[in-house]
């Protein structure tokens, strides 16, 4: 019977262990820097790290510009987006900008598009100042299904911050769908 | 039987309760205001407390101004700063403030400090209005080893709104290194 | 002893399953924007979507405009508020706003309110331009005992913005009190 | 380097007005990115803060003494700044000094030590 028990003990430490890591799925991805758009409309920002620096992924897929999931859940989702501008940078075309992220989700079955989170400024951002800066926090609790893929889009890209503390988004999962 | 089941379930239980609740550290820590040190540049906030009011820790130690992590994992961190300034104050410097946090983790092991996460804005607070206000979020999933540190650096410290549902910051772990 | 073993493997993996999902209440709030009150000074917003698109809840009960806790635990709270204009809207009574949004926590036994989390900005909203936007966004982890209720106050609410993708409130169990 | 000079001094009578000047020059020197103020010291004694003003125009700071009665003001596309001294007295006699520095704090500095840059001083007597 002791040796039961350890059979039990075992197998129940295994079972644990491996349900606890299996259901938890993670992703930090920062900006590439290298591969901004330009322009100052909304565009969906597709160059992200995920194994450097603060980056990383588990569980979670990383392709064609977008954080693939690979089992349902209920996530908590966020995003960090730095604008930042110098006045040797050269001239801003307009000193009115809207400087805005968008949180989406795609499901592949249902070829369509939702934004979960939006967030940002209007910001007047006058030549008087020789830098202008600021930053964007979104971030909540949603279920996801595997296949569905997030993304993130935002105004004027070519103000973000390149630094990976300050450009990013991420997610975790919290729960299973019960 | 039924006395060995008994006690693989009690053994399980008491495991399972032990695990759970050692795998998750967490601290809420928010701004002790009689100690805020002065200027307007950049200073790492060493005053905070951790067991008055909302503030409370768990798993985590703080000591000499920063969060010590106690056991590894993976981290939600995040801050809340806010930014006040009433004309009976007194009068500032410059209308053109660079209101920051930084959310930083030195290694004593190698003694480095980098920043994961940064947020803020240039703001203008111009004298014509007798009232300012501003606030920063952030937040980031992050991979933590015990004996590691987490600091808060702003700007313009003097600044800082004093009340505890103001200017915060803390972390939870969600999960286990794999 | 191999049923035995089968029986204690099963009564396991439900009391394991069980724990598990009872231990994690959630909820994500979307506003309902056929109900927003008007004026400018602080207002508790009461109503609140639940159980459309974006918006859900599990094991917490949403009631009268306040999130009530079911089940005592720490939480992480969490808030993203947007605020905009556009000059089709009519003409703002100032351009000086106050746009701030507070978490706030509501004891039944002890009746009395107390805020867990502020944030929010100063804003100079001119004629000037044609449209102005602002978001807000506050997190924090806090300890909540079955019966207390969560709700969210605003300046301004006539300016929110009514999508669900831009005005919510949340919050999920992270762990159990010691 | 910055240089700072001051103009506008002179004899005037008691309840009489003057305007002070301060001109800013330098290769490097933005009057946007200076706090600036007026300090004076009289005969025998210390030198004492009498105005400053934010980088941007709109904060601005007196000692109790001079409320009311003098003004300060900064035109930044001249790199100037300026106080007007209306209501003199006597007591107000003294070599006014015009000083710059980069803020290194939250709010206008008030001692002699926070500032970088000091002009050479202009004479105001008050007659009575």
């Known amino acids: 019977i002791r040796a039961e028990k350890a059979m039990v003990d075992g197998s129940w430490l295994d079972l644990a262990k491996r349900s606890k890591l299996e259901a938890q799925p993670f992703a930090h991805l920062t900006i590439n820097a290298t591969d901004i758009p330009s322009g100052s409309h909304k565009v969906s920002l597709s160059s992200w790290y995920h194994d450097r620096g603060w980056a990383k992924i588990s569980n979670m897929t990383f392709s064609n510009g977008k954080l693939i999931v690979n089992q349902d859940g209920f996530y908590y989702l966020y995003a960090n987006i730095c604008f930042r501008h110098h006045e040797t940078s050269g001239d801003l075309a307009t000193e009115y900008l809207q400087l805005m992220v968008y949180v989406t989700k795609t499901s592949i079955k249902i070829p369509s598009s939702h934004t979960l989170m939006k967030g940002g400024s209007t910001k007047y951002w006058s030549g008087n100042s020789e830098f202008h800066f600021y930053s964007i926090n979104v971030g909540g609790f949603f279920k996801l299904r595997s296949g569905e893929e997030i993304s993130i889009e935002v105004s004027n890209p070519s103000l973000l911050d390149p630094d990976q503390d300050a450009t990013y988004f991420g997610a975790f999962k919290v729960r299973d769908i019960d | 039987i039924r006395a060995e089941k008994a006690m693989v379930d009690g053994s399980w239980l008491d495991l399972a309760k032990r695990s759970k609740l050692e795998a998750q550290p967490f601290a809420h820590l928010t701004i002790n205001a009689t100690d805020i040190p002065s200027g307007s540049h950049k200073v790492s906030l060493s005053s905070w407390y951790h067991d008055r009011g909302w503030a409370k820790i768990s798993n985590m130690t703080f000591s000499n101004g920063k969060l010590i992590v106690n056991q590894d994992g993976f981290y939600y961190l995040y801050a809340n700063i806010c930014f006040r300034h009433h004309e009976t104050s007194g009068d500032l410097a410059t209308e053109y403030l660079q209101l920051m946090v930084y959310v930083t983790k030195t290694s004593i092991k190698i003694p480095s400090s980098h920043t994961l996460m940064k947020g803020g804005s240039t703001k203008y607070w111009s004298g014509n209005s007798e009232f300012h206000f501003y606030s920063i979020n952030v937040g980031g999933f992050f991979k933590l080893r015990s004996g590691e540190e987490i600091s808060i650096e702003v700007s313009n410290p003097s600044l800082l709104d004093p009340d505890q549902d103001a200017t915060y910051f803390g972390a939870f772990k969600v999960r286990d290194i794999d | 002893i191999r049923a035995e073993k089968a029986m204690v493997d099963g009564s396991w993996l439900d009391l394991a399953k069980r724990s598990k999902l009872e231990a994690q209440p959630f909820a994500h709030l979307t506003i309902n924007a056929t109900d927003i009150p008007s004026g400018s000074h602080k207002v508790s917003l009461s109503s609140w979507y639940h159980d459309r698109g974006w918006a859900k809840i599990s094991n917490m009960t949403f009631s009268n405009g306040k999130l009530i806790v079911n089940q005592d635990g720490f939480y992480y709270l969490y808030a993203n508020i947007c605020f905009r204009h556009h000059e089709t809207s009519g003409d703002l009574a100032t351009e000086y706003l106050q746009l701030m949004v507070y978490v706030t926590k509501t004891s039944i036994k002890i009746p009395s309110s107390h805020t867990l989390m502020k944030g929010g900005s100063t804003k100079y909203w001119s004629g000037n331009s044609e449209f102005h936007f602002y978001s807000i966004n506050v997190g924090g982890f806090f300890k909540l005992r079955s019966g207390e209720e969560i709700s969210i106050e605003v300046s301004n609410p006539s300016l929110l913005d009514p999508d669900q993708d831009a005005t919510y409130f949340g919050a999920f169990k992270v762990r159990d009190i010691d | 380097e910055v240089q700072l000079v001051e103009s506008g001094g002179g004899l005037v009578q008691s309840g009489g007005s003057l305007r002070l000047s301060c001109a800013a020059a330098g290769y490097t020197f933005r009057a946007r990115a200076y706090v600036m103020g007026w300090f004076r010291q009289a005969p025998g004694k210390e030198r004492e803060f009498v105005a400053a003003?934010?980088?941007?125009?709109?904060?601005?700071g007196y000692v109790d003494s001079v409320k009311d009665r003098f003004t300060i003001s900064r035109d930044n596309t001249k790199n100037t700044m300026y106080l007007q001294m209306a209501s003199l007295k006597p007591e107000d006699t003294a070599v006014y000094y015009c000083?710059?520095?980069?803020?290194?704090?939250?709010?206008?500095?008030?001692?002699?030590?926070?500032?970088?840059?000091w002009g050479q001083g202009t004479q105001v007597t008050v007659s009575s």
């Open positions: 003003i934010s980088t941007g125009g709109t904060w601005t």
């Open positions: 000083a710059a520095t980069t803020p290194s704090t939250s709010y206008l500095p008030r001692s002699e030590r926070q500032y970088e840059y």
